[in-house]
Each structure stands twice: as structure tokens, then as C-alpha cells.
């Protein structure tokens, strides 16, 4: 039960995280015009990974895409790449984890297969989260570096525009969304990896074999000893039916008076 909860929670947390990474990547407020110590302007600039926007006091917002690839700073390209890789890995991880969820039955998929898928998706989420955190951190570092540059016509524009020294940029909302989303995806991935350990079937010290009596059935006597069929006193081991063709959860493996060997 705890394993199912951990896996489910890991999936939900990762889902929220990846949605956040997608939102952050699409947002225009990666950097916003710094208004501190500046004259109060009736025009306000903010920039994203894909376009730069100007908002007027009138409410009019005009956005222009960066219609160049070669003209963009390498760091911006790197941030874009990190965020996209994070999204792609996260999306694949989500797809894999859906099939790995314990509460979803798909054909006769073994627990070991589900465990492997859970681990795979967990690792994908961890890498996805790290990509997002790295991307946002690289951009934040770029902003901090540019903020303190005092060259008269410093290059801070993401779209190849020359900005004057009075236009400085500070952290936008997308950075905080990205950091939180990346963290959530990372946590979700760790939870999936933890859940994987609980899903993996425990190895027993021996092969337990079930025999089917040809002429008669031997029943368990309530409160009495079990017929000698190779089982020891450790009833916590997984019970194997039909020569080990199918394993059941621990809770289901305890014998009752209606079980037959």
C-alpha cells in the first residue's frame, strides 16, 4: 500500500513539475526590466526565451519573436536546449510511469517489469528536473552578469538589440516557476525510484514448488500444522501457485483455511 502511494504521489508531483517546466519555458517573463533606482516609466520591457515584450501603461502589450538563430547569444540557445531536453525527458518519463503505475493493470505485466519502468521513469524525472534547474540557473547567472555590466551600450537584449545602460534586467516570474517546477520533478523522480525498490520482487533463498495431488486434495487444518509440502515456517515469503507462474502481493500471500495446495 505504501509503495502504491509513494509511486502515485511521485507520479503526481512529477506531472505538476513537468507542467511547470513547460509553463516556464513558454512564459515571456524570464527577465523583467529593473525599475529600482530608475525613473518610473510608462513603458515596461520583459523578455522570454522566444520573444521580447513591451507593456505600456495603456495596457497595450507588443511582443516580438527572436526571428534569428545565429544572432542569439549561445547561453540563450543553451538554456532553450536544456529546457526542451527537460520537457522531452519528462514527457517520456510520464508516458513510461503511466504504464508502471501499480494501480493500472495492463495484461499480465510482471511486477519486475513495473519496477524497471518505475525506475526508468524516476531517473528520467530526475534528469528532467536537473535540466530545468540548470537551464533556469544559467539564465539567472546571465542576468546577474549583465546587471552589473556598466558598458555604455551593453548587450543585454535577447533579440540582438543593443540596450542602453539605463535598461537593466532582473529575475522574472518564469525563473521562480522553473526552479520550483524543476525541484518538484526532481522530488517526483526520487519518489519513483524509492517506489521501485518496494515494487521489485524479493529474492527467496530457495525455490518453492507447489505440487498438485493427483487423487486428492490436502487441506490446511485451521490452527494445525501444514501438510509437508516443502514450505518452512516463514509464511511471509511469496506463495507460488502453478509452479511459480504468478506472484501476488504480500497481503494476499497469507494462507487462509480456504486455500488449497
Amino acid at each position: 500500500m505504501a509503495v502504491t502511494a509513494c509511486q502515485g504521489l511521485g507520479f503526481v508531483v512529477s506531472l505538476i513539475g513537468i507542467a511547470g517546466i513547460i509553463a516556464a519555458t513558454c512564459m515571456d517573463q524570464w527577465s523583467t526590466q529593473d525599475l529600482y533606482n530608475n525613473p518610473v516609466t510608462a513603458v515596461f520591457n520583459y523578455q522570454g526565451l522566444w520573444r521580447s515584450c513591451v507593456r505600456e501603461s495603456s495596457g497595450f502589450t507588443e511582443c516580438r519573436g527572436y526571428f534569428t538563430l545565429l544572432g542569439l547569444p549561445a547561453m540563450l540557445q543553451a538554456v532553450r536546449a536544456l529546457m526542451i531536453v527537460g520537457i522531452v525527458l519528462g514527457a517520456i518519463g510520464l508516458l513510461v510511469s503511466i504504464f508502471a503505475l501499480k494501480c493500472i493493470r495492463i495484461g499480465s505485466m510482471e511486477d519486475s517489469a513495473k519496477a524497471n519502468m518505475t525506475l526508468t521513469s524516476g531517473i528520467m524525472f530526475i534528469v528532467s528536473g536537473l535540466c530545468a534547474i540548470a537551464g533556469v540557473s544559467v539564465f539567472a547567472n546571465m542576468l546577474v552578469t549583465n546587471f552589473w555590466m556598466s558598458t555604455a551600450n551593453m548587450y543585454t537584449g535577447m533579440g540582438g538589440m543593443v540596450q542602453t545602460v539605463q535598461t537593466r534586467y532582473t529575475f522574472g516570474a518564469a525563473l521562480f516557476v522553473g526552479w520550483v517546477a524543476g525541484g518538484l520533478t526532481l522530488i517526483g523522480g526520487v519518489m519513483m525510484c524509492i517506489a521501485c525498490r518496494g515494487l521489485a520482487p524479493e529474492e527467496t533463498n530457495y525455490k518453492a514448488v507447489s505440487y498438485h495431488a493427483s487423487g486428492h486434495s490436502v487441506a490446511y487444518k485451521p490452527g494445525g500444522f501444514k501438510a509437508s509440502t516443502g514450505f518452512g515456517s516463514n509464511t511471509k515469503n511469496k506463495k507460488i501457485y502453478d509452479g511459480g507462474a504468478r506472484t501476488e502481493d504480500e497481503v494476499q500471500s497469507y494462507p487462509s483455511k480456504h486455500d488449497y495446495v
Epitope: A42, N45, V54, E56, S58, G59, M161, V162
Partner: antibody
Framework: QIQLVQSGSELKKPGASVKVSCKAS????????INWVRQAPGQGLEWMGW????????TYAEGFTGRFVLSWDTSVSTAYLQISSLKAEDTAVYFC???????????WGQGTLVTVSS | DIVMTQSPDSLAVSLGERATINCKSS????????????LAWYQQKPGQPPKLLIY???TRESGVPDRFSGSGSGTDFTLTISSLQAEDVAVYYC?????????FGGGTKVEIK
């Protein structure tokens, strides 16, 4: 069409208060800010401040804080300019204007003459 | 505050002639974010509210005759009336829309010679 209709002329004594109204029609009132501009007799235009009915934000020019209060009532699409403790130098025509894209004043009220005289 | 200086204070031009009004701002009105100049021109006739002619320094407001044109960038701007008509007699104001407080020029009175 877009219209800004202001209240009629006012004759007030020094120390009194006055409230000038500006009723907007022909557009969604909350979508655009209303600015107030003063024009003293024979003088140029002086920006007083503006209100953003959408965000509730108000900005005043330096000489227009304290005695001057900008407000609005969304239900009747009306902006107000209240001046308290009137002085003789407050005698002027007060205009309201809509702030439109390009930060331009595209529509103006007809103006309200406020005369302060003892 | 941004100081807007208009010149000349008054201008007498013959009908059909070109009228040119200058406006200088104490700081650049060119916004690097969108490469637009936040300057507007208004016309005010006696007893009337101002009327918008030009915004973004050179964009003509709809319904404004094409004899009115705006030019300039940064700190220096010009309003040109290519062929003065009798109905153009008015006071013309420039206004910066970049910094608060928004400020107007002192005005230029255009008359017929």
C-alpha cells in the same frame, strides 16, 4: 462611439471642495486608464495623474498629491477628480482623457471649468 | 521630470505654405525594447479640448489629414504641416509618454500670415 462627458462648470470659494466627474461610454471602462490634465487660463497643458480602473492603481504628478484625489466607480463607468481646500490658483479647466495604445490620449472630455473666487 | 521644450512659441505661415514645429526633450524618448519613440502631438483650438494628431512620434491618428506628419527620434522631434489650411490655426503641443510624470511642451501657436 467613444465619449467622455464631464460635469458642468463650478464656482467655489477658497477652502471649499469640488468633485469633477468624467463619464465614459462607447468602450469597456475598466480596460483603459483615465488621465486628468489641467489647463490654467491662457496657459499650457499640465498632466495631473491617472487611474487604472482595472488594477486600482493611481499615479499622481508631484504637484498634485494631498489635496487631489482620483477615484472611479466602475458600475457607472465614471472617473472622479476631487480637489479639497481649494485655492485661487486651482482656477483652471480640468480635462479627463483616455489613455490608449501608444500611451496616447486618444479621447478627451470637453473640460470642466473650476473657478475659485471669494 | 522630463522637460519638453517647444520652438517657436508662435508661428505665422501663409495659407498653403509649410509650417514646422520643433520639440526637444531633456531625455531620450526612444524605447529600446520596441524601437518606438514615445512622443505625441496634440492640436488645441480655442474653447476645445486637445485633439490627438500623432503618436509614437510619426504615426498619424486615424482621421487626421495627411498634411500632418511627425518625424524625429531620441530627443529631437518635428511636427510638419505640409500645406497650412485655415482650420489648422491652433496651439500645438508635444507630449512625452515615456516617463512619469507625463509632460507637455509649452505649446506653439500657429497663425495665418
Amino acid at each position: 462611439q467613444i465619449q467622455l462627458v464631464q460635469s458642468g462648470s463650478e464656482l467655489k470659494k477658497p477652502g471649499a471642495s469640488v468633485k469633477v466627474s468624467c463619464k465614459a461610454s462607447g468602450y469597456t471602462f475598466t480596460n483603459y486608464g483615465i488621465n486628468w490634465v489641467r489647463q490654467a487660463p491662457g496657459q499650457g497643458l499640465e498632466w495631473m495623474g491617472w487611474i487604472n480602473p482595472n488594477t486600482g492603481e493611481t499615479t499622481y504628478a508631484e504637484g498634485f498629491t494631498g489635496r487631489f484625489v482620483l477615484s472611479w466607480d466602475t458600475s457607472v463607468s465614471t472617473a472622479y477628480l476631487q480637489i479639497s481646500s481649494l485655492k485661487a490658483e486651482d482656477t483652471a479647466v480640468y480635462f479627463c482623457a483616455r489613455l490608449y495604445y501608444g500611451n496616447r490620449f486618444d479621447s478627451w472630455g470637453q473640460g470642466t471649468l473650476v473657478t475659485v473666487s471669494s | 521630470d522630463i522637460v519638453m521644450t517647444q520652438s517657436p512659441d508662435s508661428l505665422a505661415v501663409s495659407l498653403g505654405e509649410r509650417a514646422t514645429i520643433n520639440c526637444k526633450s531633456s531625455q531620450s524618448l526612444l524605447y529600446s525594447g520596441n524601437q518606438r519613440n514615445y512622443l505625441a502631438w496634440y492640436q488645441q483650438k480655442p474653447g476645445q479640448p486637445p485633439k490627438l494628431l500623432i503618436y509614437w512620434a510619426s504615426t498619424r491618428e486615424s482621421g487626421v489629414p495627411d498634411r500632418f506628419s511627425g518625424s524625429g527620434s531620441g530627443t529631437d522631434f518635428t511636427l510638419t504641416i505640409s500645406s497650412l489650411q485655415a482650420e489648422d490655426v491652433a496651439v500645438y503641443y508635444c507630449q512625452q509618454a515615456y516617463y512619469y510624470p507625463l509632460t507637455f511642451g509649452g505649446g506653439t501657436k500657429v497663425e495665418i500670415k
